[in-house]
C-alpha cells in the first residue's frame, strides 16, 4: 500500500516518502523508487535554515549602512545574516530592517535602561529625592544633594528637574 503519511524529515510525493533536504541544502530532484532525494548546498550568499524541499535557497539579509545597519553575525548556509544598528541607533522592528537614533530622557526623567542596537532608551520619572536637569540618553536620575552632610541647610527645595539649594545655617546671636 502506498503511504498516506511519512516519517519526520520526509515528505510525500507521487505516493512515495522522500527525504527532505537538510538545512543548508536545496532540492534538486525528488526521490524515486531507485534514487534518494537529490540536494545541493546553498551558495555562499544564501541559506536554508530548516529541513526542506525548497528548490531555491534564500538570500542572506543585506545590512544596509545607508539605513544605519551593520553586520552583527555573518550568515552561513544554514543561518541568515543578523543585522544590528550602528552606535547611537537602534532597530525599528524585531527584524531590524532600519535604524533610528536613540531617544534622550528629558529633564525630570532619567535613564532606566541604556539603549542597545536593538532596543531604545527606557526612561523613568525621577522620584522624590532625585532629579535630572539634562536631556540625556545615558544619565540616570541623581539624588538631591544632602545639605546636612555639609553642615548646610536647605534653602530651596529640590524638584524632579532641579537639585536642592543649600545655604549656611542661621547663627544665633
Amino acid at each position: 500500500e502506498p503511504p498516506t503519511a511519512c516519517r519526520e524529515k520526509q515528505y510525500l510525493i507521487n505516493s512515495q516518502c522522500c527525504s527532505l533536504c537538510q538545512p543548508g541544502q536545496k532540492l534538486v530532484s525528488d526521490c524515486t523508487e531507485f534514487t534518494e532525494t537529490e540536494c545541493l548546498p546553498c551558495s555562499e550568499s544564501e541559506f536554508l535554515d530548516t529541513w526542506n524541499r525548497e528548490t531555491r535557497c534564500h538570500q542572506h539579509k543585506y545590512c544596509d549602512p545607508n539605513l544605519g545597519l551593520q553586520v552583527q553575525q555573518k550568515g552561513t548556509s544554514e543561518t541568515d545574516t543578523i543585522c544590528t544598528c550602528e552606535e547611537g541607533l537602534h532597530c525599528t522592528s524585531e527584524s531590524c530592517e532600519s535604524c533610528v537614533p536613540h531617544r534622550s530622557c528629558l529633564p525630570g526623567f532619567g535613564v532606566k535602561q541604556i539603549a542597545t542596537g536593538v532596543s531604545d532608551t527606557i526612561c523613568e520619572p525621577c522620584p522624590v529625592g532625585f532629579f535630572s536637569n539634562v536631556s540625556s540618553a545615558f544619565e540616570k536620575c541623581r539624588p538631591w544633594t544632602s545639605c546636612e552632610t555639609k553642615d548646610l541647610v536647605v534653602q530651596q527645595a529640590g524638584t524632579n528637574k532641579t537639585d536642592v539649594v543649600c545655604g549656611p545655617q542661621d547663627r544665633q546671636r
Epitope: T32, E33, F34, T35, E36
Partner: antibody
Framework: EVQLVESGGGVVQPGRSLRLSCAAS????????MSWVRQAPGKGLEWVAS????????YYPDNVKGRFTISRDNSKNTLYLQMNSLRAEDTAVYYC??????????WGQGTLVTVSS | EIVLTQSPATLSLSPGERATLSCRAS??????LHWYQQKPGQAPRLLIY???QSISGIPARFSGSGSGTDFTLTISSLEPEDFAVYYC?????????FGQGTKVEIK
C-alpha cells in the same frame, strides 16, 4: 520466494534488435520498480535501465538512451528490455533486478547477449 | 555522473582474517550507497544498504560504515564462502553507478 527469470538472450549481429524478458514471481510485481543491469565478460556491473512500479517513469544512462526501451506488463508480471541498434560493446550478461528500499534487493540469474558479426 | 572508486582492486587474505574494502565517491552522496557480493558464475546479492544497514539473512560479520564520500565494507573474519567480488553502488542521483569492484581472493 522472490524469483526473477530472464530470457531472450542470444547471439545477434551489430545493428540488429533483441528483446529480453524477465518473469517475476513471489511478490506483488506492480508494487516495485524494476531495473536491468549488465555485466560485460570479465568486467564490472553497469546499470542499463529502470522503470517505476506503475510503468509511467523510465530512466536510462546516456550510452543506451534512444536505443534501449524498458517496459513492463503488470498483468503478466513481466519486465522487458527492447534493445535496438546493438553494438559489440552491448555484449554482456543482462540481469533483471527488483528495487526494494532503493536497492537492487533481488536479481535474476542473467541472460547472455552476444553482439557479433 | 558520480564516479565510485573502489580500492584495492584485489585483496589477498587468509580465512579468519579481517577484510577492509574501500569505496570513494567523486562527490558527497550522504549515506546513499549499497554494497553487493558476487561469486563466480552467480548473480550479485545485496549485502548492505544505506551504507551501514544490515540485510536480513546476511551474516553479522559483514558491516558497512561511512558517509559523504568515504565508505568501508568490513568482513570481520573471512569465511571460505566470502571470497568473491564486492561492488558498491550509489543511488544519490542519476545515473546509478557502481564501483569497479574489489576481488577478495585466498592468499
Amino acid at each position: 520466494e522472490v524469483q526473477l527469470v530472464e530470457s531472450g538472450g542470444g547471439v545477434v549481429q551489430p545493428g540488429r534488435s533483441l528483446r529480453l524478458s524477465c518473469a517475476a514471481s513471489g511478490f506483488t510485481f506492480s508494487n516495485y520498480g524494476m531495473s536491468w543491469v549488465r555485466q560485460a565478460p570479465g568486467k564490472g556491473l553497469e546499470w542499463v535501465a529502470s522503470i517505476s512500479s506503475g510503468g509511467d517513469d523510465t530512466y536510462y544512462p546516456d550510452n543506451v538512451k534512444g536505443r534501449f526501451t524498458i517496459s513492463r506488463d503488470n498483468s503478466k508480471n513481466t519486465l522487458y528490455l527492447q534493445m535496438n541498434s546493438l553494438r559489440a560493446e552491448d555484449t554482456a550478461v543482462y540481469y533483471c533486478t527488483r528495487a526494494g528500499g532503493k536497492a537492487m534487493d533481488y536479481w535474476g540469474q542473467g541472460t547472455l547477449v552476444t553482439v557479433s558479426s | 555522473e558520480i564516479v565510485l572508486t573502489q580500492s584495492p582492486a584485489t585483496l589477498s587474505l587468509s580465512p579468519g582474517e579481517r577484510a577492509t574494502l574501500s569505496c570513494r565517491a567523486s562527490q558527497s552522496i550522504r549515506d546513499n550507497l549499497h554494497w553487493y557480493q558476487q561469486k563466480p558464475g552467480q548473480a550479485p546479492r545485496l549485502l548492505i544498504y544505506y551504507a551501514s544497514q544490515s540485510i536480513s539473512g546476511i551474516p553479522a560479520r559483514f558491516s558497512g560504515s561511512g558517509s559523504g564520500t568515504d565508505f568501508t565494507l568490513t568482513i570481520s573474519s573471512l569465511e571460505p564462502e566470502d571470497f568473491a567480488v564486492y561492488y558498491c553502488q550509489q543511488f544519490n542521483s542519476w545515473p546509478l553507478t557502481f564501483g569497479q569492484g574489489t576481488k577478495v581472493e585466498i592468499k
